[in-house]
């Protein structure tokens, strides 16, 4: 989004010691990989690992970045432009309506489904009714498991923040 | 249930101004960050700015940078985009929306908002 090489963009040994990189607002604003001074006229680099922003802003802080839970693995670093990018460990996932937490997959279809999706780290197993092929969704009964499943492999991240 | 009615669209020339509003419903609407998006005929719908929940602090996409400011009143649960210097390409229905829960301090993608408003139409054309 910016023509500034930000923090990302350079080496380790590049990147910005405690004193921090300072450009001026264009329009009152700060790029990506920065926020705003107290008094507008400067742009302060936020602090690699540590704080991000990811547009133009007038952020009088960057945003702190976020720490993956227990039960989610880092995908990618959180860099002075992007946040870390988190995700469901293997066997788990994690719902749109409760983004918050991974849920363990269900092992199996409930008796006369069939699984035609596997448990990924954004959703759980699919099952289908063997005869109409419509979609079961909602808790498994208690009499299931004639189908069983390996984890998913993940291929995308579940969640991504900025 | 979570309501955001959007208002303040309508036709102008390229370099006039509009305000658009979004009115919402909800009681959280003053401890979330908020958006506005825009979509574009055959566009997929595109980030443009995201306030912070109190109100101090925003993000911009580059196209509007300087352009556009966003801003929020809890007290009257209303969200702001003041428009000026507008271009044919700003034409779009523009959309207020609110993050899921569990989503980054300013969510700036489409899939980290899970509440959207029916949208005002803007039109920007000589």
């Known amino acids: 989004e910016s023509a500034l090489i930000t923090q990302q963009d350079l080496a380790p040994q590049q990147r910005a010691a405690p004193q921090q990189k300072r450009s001026s607002p264009s329009e009152g604003l700060c790029p990506p990989g920065h926020h705003i001074s107290e008094d507008g006229r400067d742009c302060i680099s936020c602090k690699y690992g540590q704080d991000y922003s990811t547009h133009w802003n007038d952020l009088l802080f960057c945003l702190r970045c976020t720490r993956c839970d227990s039960g989610e693995v880092e995908l990618s670093p959180c860099t002075t432009t992007r946040n870390t990018v988190c995700q469901c460990e293997e066997g788990t996932f994690r719902e749109e309506d409760s983004p918050e937490m991974c849920r363990k997959c269900r092992t199996g279809c409930p008796r006369g489904m069939v699984k035609v999706g596997d448990c990924t780290p954004w959703s759980d197993i699919e099952c289908v009714h063997k005869e109409s092929g419509t979609k079961h969704s909602g808790e498994v009964p208690a009499v299931e498991e004639t189908v069983t499943s390996s984890p998913g492999t993940p291929a995308s991240p579940c969640s991504l923040s900025g | 249930e979570v309501q955001l009615l959007e208002s303040g669209g309508g036709e102008v020339q390229p370099g006039g101004s509009l305000r658009l509003s979004c009115a919402a419903s909800?009681?959280?609407?003053?401890?979330?960050?908020v958006g506005w998006f825009r979509q574009a005929p055959g566009k997929e719908r595109e980030f443009v700015s995201a306030?912070?929940?109190?109100?101090?602090?925003?993000y911009y996409a580059e196209s509007v940078k300087g352009r556009f400011t966003i801003s929020k009143d809890n007290a009257k649960r209303t969200l702001y985009l003041q428009m000026s210097s507008l271009r044919a390409e700003d034409t779009a229905v523009y959309y207020c929306?609110?993050?899921?829960?569990?989503?980054?301090?300013?969510?700036?993608?489409?899939?980290?908002?899970?509440?959207w408003g029916q949208g005002t139409l803007v039109t920007v054309k000589p």
């Open positions: 909800v009681s959280t609407f003053g401890t979330s960050p």
């Open positions: 929306a609110l993050p899921r829960r569990g989503e980054s301090e300013l969510p700036s993608t489409v899939k980290e908002y899970g509440y």
């Open positions: 306030i912070r929940w109190e109100g101090v602090g925003a």
